[in-house]
């Protein structure tokens, strides 16, 4: 499946769409980013490309999302990693591919682990490999909550815009 | 896990239930397709059927999803992939498994890649086997925008009600 | 990624946080619950620790969660697997895990899966292995209906609050 | 440019302790088995075992089992080694590598004696 | 475990002569399922690390010159040094991964004739 994007020119039309109202009018806090990428070793965050928004009072401030009012809200994330043959050198050990969804607030001073997923790929065994990791649930924040996520594995990250993605939704 | 499902006769009548209301009333636009367990070598969405449903004007045309009202959408979708050795060579080529969900939008010819999984199996080399994929974000929509699928591994995909889905709702 | 939660008290201080109000104020039923822990061998839920919760009429019984009124829900589930090497053969049988979310309804007198997912894992041929199952949906519930999980695998369950969790909340 | 750097080593009395320190830099350390491998003077290779810095997964040889520890900080990019009970044949320059690029550390030499 | 052996132990040679080392397994290294060999050669100097030549049997690493290359399948391996230079005197060993514990042959010592 070509990783096919609309032009951030396209997309930007299509977010100002004259007169696109919401569904059932009342504007909620959402958000959806996409992995930047231009950035092959890390994973950066953008809301200003694609089909990437932030809606309502979220903001995106050093790759965290923050949080705009208190509330329930739903948070997901997804990421795909990929490996070509013959990679791994002198080694038959597996890589170990994670994803996690962390919280920061003002509450407890450390990142909290709201969402984790996590793989062990065999890459002498099995090239090319391709692996696809998503999670998401309901969560209780906080106004001023901040958002982020922290990957293992980020130089084999399938990075376009609807294989790596970070969102959020008050309910 | 048996993949055991209601007859559509009693998931219609649970849909019909009478004075079935929505919790806190106002209705929005919601859908929650199947795939169609009776058609093996291709994925065909259904509504009529199980827990599926279309509401508040959604449709379901030409197996893609029509966006009733703009505004931004919860998008889903899941299958399930499996298999039993098809060749008795434990050197065989991987498999390619991919689902993607995509738009197809009046503002630009083309379908875009919303949400991407892929995976690569090595049916030589671990069989039976099963692998199941899951995605869903927001996105914005306008009204008239068509939601479908493309699925890479159709043969291999297990159909029911549970297994296989597509859907979406506004917020 | 370590498995760090909230003590069940921060997490308590969070979620009675004073004037901690709704973003756009209309209570919605919600819940969010965790696999217990403390339990190896079962998958027991919690809403009364770390992020959990239930708010809005959900309640739990008899480790299901009950429907408080006829509506939309989302509906979603996580588990993650893991195992260490307990045989060194290539040749070890795999390993069946499954993860499955199930409607119990006054409607019809057996559970009906409304998501499942399915894996093979092959010990003997990787290992250590991790596996992380995702899934979720919107389906059409009536007050009182109960929602419940059904694991195969339930030794291998890497339980921390932000691995294996279970939730649904109103649309 | 990737790194590995040990170090840690040094004279240990018989039955002591020592903890070594492996640095890694210049590539994402905690997807990467970080193994430990030691050479006795003028003898060949002998692997220690490894450790998943990410996962905390770890895999020992058996003769080293019960003795040795592994442990990382993915914060810190570093992995460890904690070994118990010295005796005079573990006398070694003990080295960390990293399998899947072909890195290797310089070494850093443990001397066991009293 | 699977027990490596290298053969010669040690041997002596000119610059510019063919060079080759064995290594022997117990046990087949090679995997079934996708043809390759779970086997890797290093080079040491005195008082230095071990540098990756080989893997997977007959992989060079990057930045090795093209006189050395890796051959053999199952358990039996070479190592060739097509045209010895100076800086090749060294120890040489081959290892493992197919299974735990790794392990390494004794060391093929190349000397100066």
């Known amino acids: 499946l070509p990783g096919v994007g609309l032009t951030p020119s396209a997309a930007q039309t299509a977010r100002q769409h004259p007169k696109m109202h919401l569904a059932h009018s009342t504007l909620k806090p959402a958000a959806h980013l996409i992995g930047d990428p231009s950035k092959q070793n890390s994973l950066l965050w953008r809301a200003n490309t694609d089909r990437a928004f932030l809606q309502d009072g979220f903001s995106l401030s050093n790759n965290s999302l923050l949080v705009p009012t208190s509330g329930i809200y739903f948070v997901y994330s997804q990421v795909v990693f990929s490996g070509k043959a013959y990679s791994p050198k002198a080694t038959s050990s597996p890589l170990y591919l994670a994803h996690e969804v962390q919280l920061f607030s003002s509450q407890y001073p450390f990142h909290v682990p709201l969402l984790s997923s996590q793989k062990m790929v065999y890459p002498g065994l099995q090239e090319p490999w391709l692996h696809s990791m998503y999670h998401g649930a309901a969560f209780q924040l906080t106004q001023g909550d901040q958002l982020s996520t922290h990957t293992d594995g980020i130089p084999h990250l399938v990075l376009s815009p609807s294989t790596v993605f970070f969102g959020a939704f008050a309910l | 896990l048996p993949g055991v499902g209601l007859t559509p006769s009693a998931a219609q009548t649970a849909r019909q239930h009478p004075k079935m209301h929505l919790a806190h009333s106002t209705l929005k636009p919601a859908a929650h397709l199947i795939g169609d367990p009776s058609k093996q070598n291709s994925l065909l969405w259904r509504a009529n059927t199980d827990r599926a449903f279309l509401q508040d004007g959604f449709s379901l045309s030409n197996n893609s999803l029509l966006v009733p009202t703009s505004g931004i959408y919860f998008v889903y979708s899941q299958v399930v992939f499996s298999g039993k050795a098809y060749s008795p060579k434990a050197t065989s080529s991987p498999l390619y498994l991919a689902h993607e969900v995509q738009l197809f939008s009046s503002q630009y010819p083309f379908h875009v890649p919303l949400l991407s999984s892929q995976k690569m199996v090595y049916p030589g080399l671990q069989e039976p086997w099963l692998h199941s994929m899951y995605h869903g974000a927001a996105f914005q929509l306008t009204q008239g925008d068509q939601l479908s699928t493309h699925t890479d591994g159709i043969p291999h995909l297990v159909l029911s009600p549970s297994t296989v889905f597509f859907g979406a709702f506004a917020l | 990624l370590p498995g760090v939660g909230l003590t069940p008290s921060a997490a308590q201080t969070a979620r009675q946080h004073p004037k901690m109000h709704l973003a756009h104020s209309t209570l919605k039923p919600a819940a969010h619950l965790i696999g217990d822990p403390s339990k190896q061998n079962s998958l027991l839920w919690r809403a009364n620790t770390d992020r959990a919760f239930l708010q809005d009429g959900f309640s739990l019984s008899n480790n299901s969660l009950l429907v408080p009124t006829s509506g939309i829900y989302f509906v979603y589930s996580q588990v993650v697997f893991s195992g260490k090497a307990y045989s060194p053969k290539a040749t070890s049988s795999p390993l069946y895990l499954a993860h499955e979310v199930q409607l119990f309804s006054s409607q019809y007198p057996f559970h009906v899966p409304l998501l499942s997912s399915q894996k093979m894992v092959y010990p003997g041929l990787q290992e250590p292995w991790l596996h992380s199952m995702y899934h979720g949906a919107a389906f059409q519930l009536t007050q009182g209906d109960q929602l419940s999980t059904h694991t195969d695998g339930i030794p291998h369950l890497v339980l921390s609050p932000s691995t294996v969790f279970f939730g649904a909340f109103a649309l | 440019e990737v790194q590995l750097v040990e170090s840690g080593g040094g004279l240990v009395q018989p039955g002591g302790s020592l903890r070594l320190s492996c640095a890694a830099s210049g590539y994402t350390f905690s997807s990467y088995w970080i193994e430990w491998v030691r050479q006795a003077p003028g003898k060949g290779l002998e692997w220690v075992g490894e450790i998943s810095p990410g996962s905390g997964s770890t895999n020992y040889n058996e003769e080293f089992k019960g003795r040795a520890t592994f442990s990382a900080d993915n914060s810190k990019n570093t992995a460890y080694l904690q070994m118990n009970s010295l005796r005079a044949e573990d006398t070694a320059v003990y080295y960390c590598?990293?399998?899947?690029?072909?890195?290797w550390g310089q070494g850093t030499l443990v001397t066991v004696s009293s | 475990d699977i027990q490596m052996t290298q053969s010669p132990s040690s041997l002596s040679a000119s610059v510019g002569d063919r060079v080759t080392i064995t290594c022997k397994s117990s046990?087949?290294?090679?995997?079934?399922?996708?043809?390759?060999?779970?086997l890797a050669w290093y080079q040491q100097k005195p008082g230095k690390a071990p540098k990756l030549l080989i893997y997977w049997a007959s992989t060079r690493d990057s930045g090795v010159p093209s006189r050395f290359s890796g051959s053999g399948s199952g358990t039996d391996f070479t190592l060739t040094i097509s045209s010895l230079q100076p800086e090749d005197f060294a120890t040489y060993y081959c290892q493992q991964y197919y299974s735990y514990p790794r392990t390494f042959g004794q060391g093929t010592k190349v000397e100066i004739k």
């Open positions: 590598a990293d399998g899947y690029h072909g890195y």
């Open positions: 046990q087949s290294l090679l995997y079934s399922a996708n043809q390759k060999n779970f």
